[in-house]
């Protein structure tokens, strides 16, 4: 059920994820509607604590019944995640919060004319997902015009204080306004030597792409195909970095193939939703349900209609058995990160996600590939 | 593989599951072997740090391909679980722990001649798990011969620190030395309505008995069965306890059954291991692995065979298609706490639990009870 | 407050039988332990039979197994101790005892509340 209303001075109780910092209720359900777990979340306003470091926490939570007990709360503003809403969602936010200071890892600073120019600056530089601009009022007078680039591991600030004479704000690569090169191809035999920030599993190199895309630090990536030769890194997708933010190094090997992150490209393409099938194939994770249905179809639209449910895995019924009418399996699953655990073959199942990270993707993309 | 040396002045690193206290490697070992998914652990000893609140830091850990990287670290001593080997496990510690204190909840003191009598009462108190006592030599005269009973939610200590003139040590209920009542009845058609500290899902009451046993602080338990009218609550085992260590209110309603924890019997049944098979039963979870095997007993080896492995469900082949003699299909499975996410029942698997708790049960109950 | 209230004692052949009663008040026996003690002249108290009284579980001393039988009544707030096949060293005072905790059931130092006991008496 689609809940849009936000519940004033109350707080969920129980049910954390985990606990970010975000400048706003409605970038707390952003982050939580990102997230993949996410379906409810709170977020502690400005004053909702004698304590100023638990101000701006934003407190991701997951519920297996999909609802919590609502505690009073002075200052805690409590919402559910868009994921059970049918509406268009989007990653984009151009609000700018004033006499906030979002902290983070500040990596580069300059002078610049004005707050948009430093947003631009932000959206334009590969490692940047948010920045301080220091206004004309800013008490030091040394530090007035200073633009602050700032990244973070969650790509979320660590901690937001009141400042008096700044504004601060995202990037706006997610809303299809950088400039930075958008490269497409992706390099078959190439195995990358980077940083790996993270690794999750993946059937194929187009998804690896895709949940790179969708991680905050990920720039480019290594995928390790089937038939890798070292079977425990098979569907290994490999997230990396550089302080460039180009590979440094590339070595030629077979069964391998890497590629960048398309965060800052202006998409005609599903970069959020994996909207394909795959044959004779097992993704395993947490089993949420099995339920009886006739056709993978309806099985990843089932998968799509519950809030939980990230990918599932589909065993069609016994046709030699003259049972050709007769619904197969459809085991609905999930996992930590909204990938699989491991992925099997040689099993005859047909496996797929969830679908509804494709309302994040945009209009021209969902009309181009509208499953 | 089993590996029972320990690495001295090694860390394993990453793989945290959860930090306890534990006065000894050897204890650390313990609490290891008897958590749900710890295969490794790595243990702080005394001075093994500048500071002394990190001493004694039992790091349980885990791992998907049962091994962690060594790292050189003074002072640290690490190794794996008894999962992996095949001897005879016990629970009982009967050490004793010169000038440690053991903190916890101190519920009780009483004077006592000494550290065995002191033992004793906590082996005889409901709620006791490790006691300290206040030698002769005890610097604070009026301390002396004091004996502190004492609890914590997850049955270790808080934290240990130095202290001169105490004795710490553990309970010996899990030695068959208690004298306190052994309760077997199980009673139907009753909730005990005294307050819950936590629940699992369970097959059936006889399960849901043994993990109340297993449990730090559980005394009693109502189980809800799959008959029980409210669907969510069903297979719902609810772990209990009270002040008095006896239910306080007894509510007659049918499809509940209710029993007591088995932690001070003297055993002649299996109080850790589940050795049933359940029919057209699916235990859901997070999956580990799919193998192709011939019959429950084999995917009941298959698991137990796994250090990872909890439970499974098993698919026989489709007798129905002249295929008498194919394999069926193993699915290995674990969770968060080693007990099943959900259960469903009508989908045709046949389900059951590792046997390698029954390593645990002591040598009459393993004779009794083989499998 | 909690009063227990013995009786049923008294004199009797060996090989015979008694039935002692304890009536409980100001307390609902229906989750508690309630024990039967006996102290002989010159003796320690020593636990002889205990239940259970949420359920049916009992306990007992191997003393006095096969012979002794405790069991209770819980409308009325009466637990009984059957004695068959008495024995002279049978012979003391049998007090009744109660404590609304889990408890060590034959232990005479866990037991909060106490009657003023009954005397048995077997002779040969």
């Known amino acids: 059920e689609c809940v849009t209303k936000v519940f004033k001075d109350i707080s969920f109780q129980g049910g954390d994820l985990s606990t970010v910092f975000t400048p706003s209720a409605t970038y707390c359900r952003l982050v939580c509607t990102h997230h993949p777990r996410c379906l409810l979340f709170t977020f502690m306003a400005e004053s909702s604590s004698d304590d100023p470091t638990k101000w701006f926490a934003c407190i991701l939570k997951d519920s297996v019944t999909e609802i919590l007990p609502m505690v009073n709360m002075t200052g805690a503003i409590s919402g559910y995640s868009f994921k059970q809403c049918p509406q268009q969602l989007s990653t984009c936010s151009k609000d700018v919060y004033v006499n906030l200071d979002m902290k983070g890892m500040n990596y580069n600073s300059s002078v610049v004319k004005n707050a948009r120019e430093c947003q631009e600056r932000c959206t334009d530089d590969a490692h940047c997902q948010f920045f301080t601009y220091a206004t004309g009022y800013f008490p030091s007078v040394d530090h007035r015009k200073m633009c602050l680039l700032k990244y973070t591991r969650t790509g979320t600030p660590t901690t937001i204080t009141k400042l008096n004479g700044v504004v601060s704000g995202f990037s706006l690569k997610s809303c299809g306004l950088s400039n930075l090169a958008c490269i497409r191809d992706i390099f078959p035999n190439t195995v990358l030597a980077d940083l790996n920030i993270d690794s999750v599993v993946a059937p194929d190199a187009f998804v690896c792409r895709r949940i790179c895309t969708h991680h905050p630090t990920c720039l480019f990536f290594t995928f390790f195909s089937q038939a890798w030769p070292k079977e425990s890194q098979r569907h290994l997708c490999l997230l990396k970095t550089s302080e460039s933010g180009l590979p440094s190094t590339r070595i030629t090997k077979s069964h391998a193939l890497s590629g960048f992150s398309l965060q800052h490209c202006r998409h005609s393409v599903p970069v959020f939703c994996h909207p394909s099938f795959y044959n004779d194939t097992d993704f395993l994770g947490e089993e949420l349900d099995i339920v009886d249905v006739k056709g993978q179809e309806t099985c990843q639209k089932t998968c799509t209609n519950n809030a939980r449910c990230q990918f599932f895995t589909y065993y069609p019924s016994h046709r030699l058995c003259n049972e050709r009418n007769r619904r197969g399996r459809c085991y609905l699953k999930l996992s930590s990160n909204g990938s699989p655990t491991r992925i099997l073959h040689g099993r005859g199942g047909i496996s797929g996600y969830s679908l509804r990270l494709c309302k994040m993707d945009n209009v021209c993309t969902t009309k181009i590939n509208p499953r | 593989e089993c590996v029972t040396k320990v690495f001295k002045d090694i860390s394993f690193q990453g793989g945290d599951l959860s930090t306890v206290f534990t006065p000894s490697a050897t204890y650390c070992r313990l609490v290891c072997t008897h958590h749900p998914r710890c295969l490794l652990f790595t243990f702080m000893a005394e001075s093994s740090s500048d500071d002394p609140t990190k001493w004694f830091a039992c790091i349980l850990k885990d791992s998907v391909t049962e091994i962690l990287p060594m790292v050189n670290m003074t002072g640290a001593i690490s190794g794996y679980s008894f999962k992996q080997c095949p001897q005879q496990l016990s629970t009982c510690s009967k050490d004793v722990y010169v000038n440690l204190d053991m903190k916890g909840m101190n519920y009780n003191s009483s004077v006592v001649k000494n550290a065995r009598e002191c033992q004793e009462r906590c082996t005889d108190d409901a709620h006791c798990q490790f006691f300290t006592y206040a030698t002769g030599y005890f610097p604070s005269v009026d301390h002396r011969k004091m004996c502190l009973l004492k609890y914590t939610r997850t049955g270790t200590p808080t934290t240990i620190t130095k202290l001169n003139g105490v004795v710490s040590g553990f309970s010996l209920k899990s030695c068959g030395l208690s004298n306190l009542a052994c309760i077997r009845d199980i009673f139907p058609n009753t909730v005990l309505a005294d307050l819950n500290i936590d629940s699992v899902v369970a097959p059936d009451a006889f399960v849901c008995r043994r993990i109340c046993t297993h449990h730090p602080t559980c005394l009693f338990f109502t189980f809800f069965s799959q008959a029980w009218p409210k669907e969510s609550q069903r297979h719902l085992c609810l772990l209990k306890t009270s002040e008095s260590g006896l239910p306080s209110t007894r509510i007659t309603k049918s499809h509940a059954l209710s029993g007591f924890s088995l932690q001070h019997c003297r055993h002649s049944v299996p109080v850790f291991c589940h050795p049933s098979f359940y029919n057209d039963t699916d235990f859901l979870g997070e999956e580990l692995d799919i193998v192709d095997v011939k019959g429950q007993e084999t995917c009941q080896k298959t698991c137990t065979n796994n250090a990872r492995c909890q439970f499974f469900t098993y698919y026989p082949s489709h007798r129905l298609c002249n295929e008498r003699n194919r394999r069926g299909r193993c699915y290995l499975k674990l969770s968060s706490n080693g007990s099943p996410t959900r259960i469903l029942h009508g989908r045709g698997g046949i389900s059951g639990y590792s046997l390698r708790l029954c390593k645990m049960d002591n040598v009459c109950t393993t004779k009794i009870n083989p499998r | 407050q909690v009063q227990l209230q013995e009786s049923g004692g008294g004199s009797v052949q060996a090989g015979g039988s008694l039935r002692l009663s304890c009536a409980a008040s100001?307390?609902?026996?229906?989750?508690?332990?309630m024990g039967w003690f006996r102290q002989a002249p010159g003796k320690e108290r020593e636990g002889v039979a205990a239940?259970?009284?949420?359920?049916?579980?009992?306990f007992y001393a191997d003393s006095v197994k096969g012979r002794f039988t405790i069991s209770q009544d819980n409308a009325k707030n009466t637990v009984y101790l059957e004695m068959d096949t008495l024995k002279p060293e049978d012979t003391a005072m049998y007090y009744c005892?109660?404590?609304?905790?889990?408890?060590?059931?034959?232990?005479?130092?866990?037991?909060?509340?106490w009657g003023q006991g009954t005397q048995v008496t077997v002779s040969s």
């Open positions: 005892a109660a404590a609304p905790r889990w408890i060590a059931p034959l232990r005479a130092d866990r037991y909060e509340y």
């Open positions: 100001g307390f609902t026996a229906s989750s508690n332990f």
């Open positions: 239940i259970y009284t949420g359920g049916a579980s009992t």
